[in-house]
Amino acid sequence: GSQHIRAEKAMVDGSWLDLAKRSKLEAQPFAHLTINATDIPSGSHKVSLSSWYHDRGWGKISNMTFSNGKLIVNQDGFYYLYANICFRHHETSGDLATEYLQLMVYVTKTSIKIPSSHTLMKGGSTKYWSGNSEFHFYSINVGGFFKLRSGEEISIEVSNPSLLDPDQDATYFGAFKVRDID
Amino acid sequence: GSQHIRAEKAMVDGSWLDLAKRSKLEAQPFAHLTINATDIPSGSHKVSLSSWYHDRGWGKISNMTFSNGKLIVNQDGFYYLYANICFRHHETSGDLATEYLQLMVYVTKTSIKIPSSHTLMKGGSTKYWSGNSEFHFYSINVGGFFKLRSGEEISIEVSNPSLLDPDQDATYFGAFKVRDID
Amino acid sequence: GSQHIRAEKAMVDGSWLDLAKRSKLEAQPFAHLTINATDIPSGSHKVSLSSWYHDRGWGKISNMTFSNGKLIVNQDGFYYLYANICFRHHETSGDLATEYLQLMVYVTKTSIKIPSSHTLMKGGSTKYWSGNSEFHFYSINVGGFFKLRSGEEISIEVSNPSLLDPDQDATYFGAFKVRDID
């Protein structure tokens, strides 16, 4: 009897390993969203970027939702959030309206329950992009660890969106769940 | 009998906890590679950096391989990849030929099966390093979440490699596995 | 008998799932510390920032300790560390002592056992903040994967602390445990 139980135990525990690994390692939400270059807004002031790819190239999403330009959390947890935003200008694109630029990114969290928006992370630089150089480039990277609740939404705002680099390796943001909330 | 089973169960489940923790938390691949300053190439255009430390100072690697200047994935999964690249110039470093510099990093993925290279992340800035200042410095940080398959290789390309800061806290890249592929 | 054992097993294994998830996902240490703007030191040289929030706004901590301006590790492991540091100046703040600035961050690790301090990561830029522009801004982001032992301490040093942006979304640092040490 005892021997039979041990054998059964080993079998159950074996499948348990698979189950635990699957439950832990595969159900964890993540997203990596890359800029949709066909739909970049214009302007120089802070604007929300609403068009991102989640299903082509490096873009991907699992156990999170992308809707109306926002990354929606489906599972409570602590997440690592990140964004990489590249700006560029070539003299062949025409003259800049000003040589003094504020190139910024803001990663914001919106709660549906309490309709309010909060900036989680910001980064950027003021730049002097003079006419003496034919090409200008600048990238911002931000990242941080945040508690997110199901239903909360993450969005990206930038200044000078018309200067964004439209490559998928240049302008993107993402999130992955690291742990549950106690 | 029932009591005996419970006790045995507790014992097995106890070792199970160790096993699960070990299997999950210790087998996860990671790498943190720091620049090998004795072997930085010259050039102004994009060049691949092939010499990195994986076993001294902050450099370390586990369940991944470093070979021929590339970080090789041994385990399918979703990984967080990152790079920090610092550039610097002091008037005693040499005769800088231009004030207008493009300081860039490209994190690339190469697939052996389909011999092709793709840029996962890029970052950097054009800089004006004038002779009016005796010292110049600039750092780039990029990071993102990517699906990597066993056998794929990660490498780092930079512009102006001779301007790299050779300190281990300055110029490095790395990866750690976050979750399995479904 | 065998049926009874199976039922008991299922029950135990069910609670096991909770236990395993809890032990793995909830006990993992993390911290996200945001700058305490009421206590920023002055000076232009490298200074240690000792005043951070860990319990308000985005600030949070679990299974780590914050004491004497340092983030103390309570659990051996491999951690992802990050920092985001923003500097800014508006002409209404008064004239800058110099237009040539070195805006830097250093993430350091101190071991109590062997009283020594080592820089894990550094980043930043030299900047020319000319009087021609009324506002200047610059952000640094660094991140990397490091082995930390219980009792070790993480601290942040910056140059030009009086230029720090005091917003919680601007100047922060953090850590989260990714895996155990083999």
């Epitope: 034919e134 | 102004s44 040499g94 005769d95 800088l96 030929a97 231009t98 004030e99 301007l163 | -």
Partner: antibody, heavy 122, light 107 residues
Framework: EVQLVESGGGLVKPGGSLRLSCAAS????????MSWVRQAPGKGLEWVAG????????YYPDTVKGRFTISRDNAKNSLYLQMNSLRAEDTAVYYC???????????????WGKGTTVTVSS | DIQMTQSPSSLSASVGDRVTITCKAS??????IAWYQQKPGKSPKLLIY???YRYTGVPSRFSGSGSGTDFTFTISSLQPEDLATYYC?????????FGGGTKVEIK
């Protein structure tokens, strides 16, 4: 056509001064570092001055440091060499040379002018 | 300063011959060596840079090799128009220094 044309050479007494000019055409002058290289009669080549593309960095060997000054005017596509306290050993053909693109710390020269002759003699 | 010693100072060879010139640096210059051709009464012309890279438009009979302190410049098949003096230059560290030159004559 990429071209460099030197002028301003001539005969000068020891201790005297001379200003050489180099007119550049056929390329985006402001993007290139430039140098002056000289060649004494029947001798080899000697680098005497270098200037960065934007003109804020200038470099000299010890043989001319403090006596020669290199400068440029990117708006006029022009390079200059002001030579003071001239000596007999400064007698040479002076070439204006464009530094090729390459590593930012390494200087070699892909376009040369025809040269202008400087003779220092009493 | 880095001294560049070129040898031979002159040589005479026939059309079609393989000609080799050597250049020795007084210290390690990695692969930072350029080679120039200067025809009589003309200005120098860049042939090779970074020890082995042929500059745009330079015929394939000209090649360079070496690293560290010892470098070689080769003309695989000498042509009448190759009559010139050849100079090496280190572009590793300032001041940029040239070899004394090698005068190549046609027999």
């Amino acid at each position: 056509e990429v071209q460099l044309v030197e002028s301003g050479g001539g005969l000068v007494k020891p201790g005297g001064s001379l200003r050489l000019s180099c007119a550049a055409s056929g390329f985006t002058f402001r993007n290139y570092a430039m140098s002056w290289v000289r060649q004494a009669p029947g001798k080899g080549l000697e680098w005497v001055a270098g200037i960065s593309s934007g003109g804020t960095y200038t470099y000299y060997p010890d043989t001319v440091k403090g006596r020669f000054t290199i400068s440029r005017d990117n708006a006029k596509n022009s390079l200059y060499l002001q030579m003071n306290s001239l000596r007999a050993e400064d007698t040479a053909v002076y070439y204006c040379a464009r530094r090729d693109y390459g590593d930012v710390y390494e200087w070699y020269f892909d376009v040369w002018g025809k040269g202008t002759t400087v003779t220092v003699s009493s | 300063d880095i001294q560049m010693t070129q040898s031979p100072s002159s040589l005479s060879a026939s059309v079609g011959d393989r000609v080799t010139i050597t250049c020795k640096a007084s210290q390690d210059v990695r692969t930072s060596i350029a080679w120039y051709q200067q025809k009589p009464g003309k200005s120098p012309k860049l042939l090779i840079y970074s020890a082995s890279y042929r500059y745009t438009g330079v015929p394939s009979r000209f090649s360079g090799s070496g690293s560290g302190t010892d470098f070689t410049f080769t003309i695989s098949s000498l042509q009448p128009e190759d009559l010139a003096t050849y100079y090496c230059q280190q572009h590793y560290s300032s001041p940029w220094t040239f070899g004394g030159g090698t005068k190549v004559e046609i027999k």
